[in-house]
Amino acid sequence: APVPPGEDSKDVAAPHRQPLTSSERIDKQIRYILDGISALRKETCNKSNMCESSKEALAENNLNLPKMAEKDGCFQSGFNEETCLVKIITGLLEFEVYLEYLQNRFESSEEQARAVQMSTKVLIQFLQKKAKNLDAITTPDPTTNASLLTKLQAQNQWLQDMTTHLILRSFKEFLQSSLRALRQM
């Protein structure tokens, strides 16, 4: 697994370097998670032909994965810093149950899956410190999450492979949109 941000050897060797700003730390954290997702996607794609799945087939799912929309204020047109930040944090909180699901889905990248999950928790904490309007952030219901997790784990193997592929793809897209938006803040 790649070294988490703030723990790389270069930081230790260069004590006189300026400490990272909050925005830089968030940027670095997202890029670190994206690297982890790339590694997980590589294993998924090598294992099966899921990555060739058509967009139509992937669209026919009943997963409620977070997705950026125009109204969220994260796109260049209609950009709204506060609304967008709330959306990013809420979305990441909603992704957590899916990241938990991924934990037993990888054979050779088990540590990588754990690193993505833990790094996302850290990212949420960073972003919550940045947000002014924490009251607007809705936390997913633990009971609903528990039953969703049970349901996902009960699926047949093909559906679990497809679900894994879709979660990784959607999470990557969400983080890329978040990264672009956060760079405007």
Epitope: E60, N62, N156, Q157, W158, L159
Partner: antibody, heavy 119, light 111 residues
Amino acid sequence: EVQLQQSGPELVKPGASVKMSCKASGYTFTSYVMHWVKQKPGQGLEWIGYINPYNDGTKYNEKFKGKATLTSDKSSSTAYMELSSLTSEDSAVYYCAREGYGNLERDCWGQGTSVTVSS
Amino acid sequence: DIVLTQSPASLAVSLGQRATISCRASESVDGFGISFMNWFQQKPGQPPKLLIYVASNQGSGVPARFRGRGRGTRFSLNIHPMEEDDSAMYFCQQSKEVPWTFGGGTKLEIK
């Protein structure tokens, strides 16, 4: 051709245990999940559980927890099911069935193992 | 668990006619464009024989007179034209998730 060959019929006494086998051929044994299904005489079908031979991960129907134990042996491409503390309620035909994969691979069933519990 | 309700419980059809068996699921058995509904034929003393998998695909060696259709929660098995050899028990089964569940069965006889 995918084939599942199950062990022969068993006549066992109440309270005893029985272990039946399901030998797989024609495919990579560790790449597919193996399910077990029960059918009592003249009745419907009931799912017992499954084993993933890749990592020996198992999942059981609540009703069969403590009754059935699923294991597998990669070297011989064989799945096993052991039934313990047998009663007349356990008299049935037991099937192993390999799970398919999407619309590319269909499920495949064994011929069944008949278990009769009688004193 | 997904409950499968099969109807009718028994059916008598004349040779050459059409037999239709229905199976309704308590929730959708679809996922990513595939319906995980299977149909089996079982004769006394024999193991279940897979006729149709993923709603409409024919099992190997299954005659074309066996047709499966449906998606979501509603499925049907059509046999046309009915032949002598088709007299048996028929079961629907969902393999979308565990526990695998089965319909109560339909006893099909020759009228």
